[in-house]
């Protein structure tokens, strides 16, 4: 089948005093082949504090998954989700409150 | 459009200390953003020295941590770069930059300034 | 640290040849690169971020291409103004650190 970008919605929740739980999800791609990772400060955040949803079939055709992270609250600014799919990539922020992100790529 | 303009002294003396100031203009440093100081020795490396974000937290390269400090000035939109104990060897062109936090990539430099440590 | 070794340090060429510059991490950075030109006498210039994404304003004629340890930048067509200095940069972690430099000089 022919290329589907990934939706990509950034949300937050509550995760303990002063913590919050980030959560990027790629949702409706294909192919499968699909990067999604947090950066922090701009660079790589280490793998063992990220946690992972596998690449799981939504049923029509196409794919999604879901990458975590915990971070201290204030600082969402030196946060962003990073999604590469099919040689085009995005970047998306963590809303401020409890409002979500929803985004296109545009490249 | 984010413009940086590096300042201060031309010639240090062995020993003491390199102070210099770059002047952000068209974005406020608090708002956003990582405050950068590279530098490029004569022989054109170059050198990630460090930060300053936006919050005010510092991240600095662990060669350089011991010697290291940088400030701002959040009134005058300024931030500031101290290197004690220079030696010949911070003989470079210093210069400011900025990334954003979708990337450690650095969109846009000062003109730079060179800094000459000779007795 | 990640160590960037780029090569050639030096290369002649003449307009409207194709050259190619190669950039080895001595880690895996994952896409985490981006390049610079950099004119004798002024500042370094942004040309790709993400290993592969041109800078907004960078011609057509440059190209960038690799994956985890090596990765490389293609100018097409050279153009006089094309001539000068070509740095690599890591951003997968910190110390941020560049390549030795590139130097294109006229043939």
């Known amino acids: 089948g022919s290329t589907v970008p990934p939706m990509v919605n950034v949300t937050r929740s509550e995760a303990s005093e002063g913590n919050i739980t980030v959560t990027c999800r790629a949702s409706s791609f294909y192919p499968r082949n699909i990067i999604l990772t947090w950066r922090q400060d701009g660079v790589s955040l280490s793998h063992d504090t990220q946690q992972w949803g596998d690449v799981l079939p939504d049923g029509n055709g196409t794919y999604q998954t879901w990458v975590a992270t915990r971070i201290c609250r204030g600082e969402e600014q030196r946060f962003t989700c990073y999604m590469e799919h099919s040689g085009n990539h995005s970047t998306h922020p963590v809303p401020s409150g409890n409002s979500h992100h929803h985004h296109h790529h545009h490249h | 459009d984010v413009q940086l303009q590096e300042s201060g002294p031309g010639l240090v003396k062995p020993s003491q200390s390199l102070s210099l100031t770059c002047t952000v203009t068209?974005?406020?440093?608090?708002?956003?953003?990582?405050w950068n100081w590279i530098r490029q020795f004569p022989r054109n490396k170059l050198e990630w020295m460090g930060y300053?974000?936006?919050?005010?937290?510092?991240n600095y390269n662990p060669s350089l941590k011991s010697r290291i400090s940088i400030t701002r000035d959040t009134s005058k939109n300024q931030f500031f770069l101290q290197l004690i104990s220079v030696t010949t060897e911070d003989t470079a062109t210093y210069y400011c930059?900025?990334?954003?936090?979708?990337?450690?990539?650095?969109?846009?430099w000062g003109q730079g300034t060179l800094v000459t440590v000779s007795a | 640290d990640i160590q960037m070794t780029q090569s050639p340090a030096s290369l002649s060429a003449s307009v409207g040849e194709t050259v190619t510059i190669t950039c080895r991490a001595s880690?895996?950075?994952?896409?985490?690169l981006a390049w610079y030109q950099q004119k004798q006498g002024k500042s370094p210039q942004l040309l790709v971020y993400?290993?592969?994404m041109l800078a907004d304003g960078v011609p057509s004629r440059f190209s960038a291409s690799g994956s985890g340890t090596q990765y490389s930048l293609k100018i097409n067509s050279l153009q006089p103004e094309d001539f000068g200095s070509y740095y690599c940069?890591?951003?997968?972690?910190?110390?941020?650190?560049f390549g030795a430099g590139t130097k294109v000089e006229i043939k």
């Open positions: 930059s900025y990334y954003r936090y979708d990337g450690a990539w650095f969109p846009y």
């Open positions: 068209g974005y406020s440093i608090t708002s956003d953003y990582a």
């Open positions: 300053i974000n936006y919050s005010g937290t510092t």
């Open positions: 880690g895996n950075i994952h896409n985490y």
């Open positions: 993400n290993a592969i």
């Open positions: 940069q890591h951003f997968w972690s910190f110390p941020l650190t």
